[in-house]
């Protein structure tokens, strides 16, 4: 039987597969047409009649060529901490991803099952590793000569200003206070600039030691709140 001349349904030659977009129906023992994405098999094929396909109903879908009797249900609506990045259509499931300021704590095949707010580093701590779509912020204590006076998921430790005359020495959570009218800001060569909120003061940074690669201990799951990790604060 030359390829692609027989019309479905047809009995394949022994040892031959069915052709493109066909499946072998064990009951009919025939090669039959699959249904296209957005459809499902309303009536299965027989020895004399091909598959009858029908469109998926609202809120259901099939993404692949198939011969399923019913379309799959689209996932539930996205929660308030998520945005819908792909709508539910006859050919694709809804996809929900985390909104800005949140990360995916529990992913699913496509999109996110559970979003969690990005950790905020409290004063005296800065961002060692920024948050991503799937990982939380990692905080670290500000090294000597640097400070952070904010509670933020983006701010890093910044160098103290250099005073001609120091009024109040800086610490990990506070900048130095100068008596001089013209303080000079320390500028490290090859400074790294992480994304930061716009501020009225200059925010030069200096290279910092590599953050610890120890895993975050604050992992928000629906089993109730856990104590915040060192240097972080809950929302």
């Amino acid at each position: 039987l030359p390829a692609q001349v027989a019309f479905t349904p047809y009995a394949p030659e022994p040892g031959s597969t069915c052709r493109l977009r066909e499946y072998y129906d064990q009951t009919a023992q025939m090669c039959c047409s699959k249904c296209s994405p957005g459809q499902h098999a309303k009536v299965f094929c027989t020895k004399t009649s091909d598959t009858v396909c029908d469109s998926c109903e609202d809120s259901t879908y099939t993404q692949l060529w198939n011969w399923v009797p019913e379309c799959l249900s689209c996932g539930s609506r996205c929660s308030s901490d998520q945005v819908e990045t792909q709508a539910c259509t006859r050919e694709q499931n809804r996809i929900c991803t985390c909104r800005p300021g949140w990360y995916c704590a529990l992913s699913k095949q496509e999109g996110c099952r559970l979003c969690a707010p990005l950790r905020k580093c409290r004063p005296g701590f800065g961002v060692a590793r920024p948050g991503t779509e799937t990982s939380d912020v990692v905080c670290k204590p500000c090294a000597p000569g640097t400070f952070s006076n904010t509670t933020s998921s983006t701010d890093i430790c910044r160098p103290h200003q250099i005073c001609n005359v120091v009024a109040i020495p800086g610490n990990a959570s506070m900048d130095a206070v100068c008596t001089s009218t013209s303080p000079t800001r320390s500028m490290a060569p090859g400074a790294v600039h992480l994304p930061q909120p716009v501020s009225t003061r200059s925010q030069h940074t200096q290279p910092t030691p590599e953050p610890s690669t120890a895993p975050s201990t604050s992992f928000l799951l629906p089993m109730g709140p856990s104590p915040p990790a060192e240097g972080s604060t809950g929302d």
């Epitope: 390829a3 692609q4 394949p12 040892g15 031959s16 597969t17 052709r19 493109l20 977009r21 692949l64």
Partner: antibody
Framework: QVQLVQSGAEVKKPGASVKVSCKAS????????INWVRQAPGQGLEWIGW????????QYAQKFQGRVTMTTDTSTSTAYMELRSLRSDDTAVYYC????????????WGQGTTVTVSS | DIQMTQSPSSLSASVGDRVTITCRAS??????LNWYQQKPGKAPKLLIY???KLHSGVPSRFSGSGSGTDFTLTISSLQPEDFATYYC?????????FGGGTKLEIK
């Protein structure tokens, strides 16, 4: 990662047979067709056929029917293509490729096996 | 068998250029048109399937369009790594058939 690794180059005499192997890794071997495609020197691509490893059933291009045999060994995730009665115009690079039977594309390719037919 | 005809057979262009390659099928193949890139001594790589769906990991500067018998592959802004030979292939009917290829060279 998903990959297909083919056997080494072969030199054959006209009238002989050649058997090329293709070892799959990084995915479930039995759930995708393995296709064979060849490319003569400086020429385009030509589809030879496919085999479905789950049941060993095949689909060959008419041109190669009777001269080609595709087989698989699911225990080693390896596909084989044997071409018989070789002629000089069978000199080509033979590729195995994982195929999608719904859209008819080849998404993962082996590195190719050069088969030279010369007297 | 369905014949696939590509044009041009070769093409010279510069980095940053917008390039279009066309592929014509001898009969209607709906949207079952796939595009591959091949570099010398290497296996082809899938770029686009089902006329316009980008294969995973393929840069968005590649796009496909058309339907029925006439299709195009467009590279919006040529990069140095894009100089290669491009093949179209129909996935509508057996036997699966390829175009003769378009060699994209540096001008």
């Amino acid at each position: 990662q998903v990959q297909l690794v083919q056997s080494g180059a072969e030199v054959k005499k006209p009238g002989a047979s050649v058997k090329v192997s293709c070892k799959a890794s990084g995915y479930t071997f039995i759930t995708y067709d393995i296709n064979w495609v060849r490319q003569a020197p400086g020429q385009g691509l030509e589809w030879i056929g496919w085999i479905y490893p789950r049941d060993g059933n095949t689909q060959y291009a008419q041109k190669f029917q009777g001269r080609v045999t595709m087989t698989t060994d699911t225990s080693t995730s390896t596909a084989y293509m044997e071409l018989r009665s070789l002629r000089s115009d069978d000199t080509a690079v033979y590729y195995c490729a994982r195929g999608d039977r719904d859209y008819g594309y080849f998404d993962v390719w082996g590195q190719g096996t050069t088969v030279t037919v010369s007297s | 068998d369905i014949q696939m005809t590509q044009s041009p057979s070769s093409l010279s262009a510069s980095v940053g250029d917008r390039v279009t390659i066309t592929c014509r099928a001898s009969q209607d193949i709906s949207n079952y048109l796939n595009w591959y890139q091949q570099k010398p001594g290497k296996a082809p790589k899938l770029l686009i399937y089902f006329k316009s769906k980008l294969h995973s990991g393929v840069p968005s500067r590649f796009s496909g369009s058309g339907s029925g018998t006439d299709f195009t592959l467009t590279i919006s802004s040529l990069q140095p790594e894009d100089f290669a030979t491009y093949y179209c292939q129909q996935g509508n009917t057996l036997p699966l058939t390829f175009g003769g290829g378009t060699k994209l060279e540096i001008k």
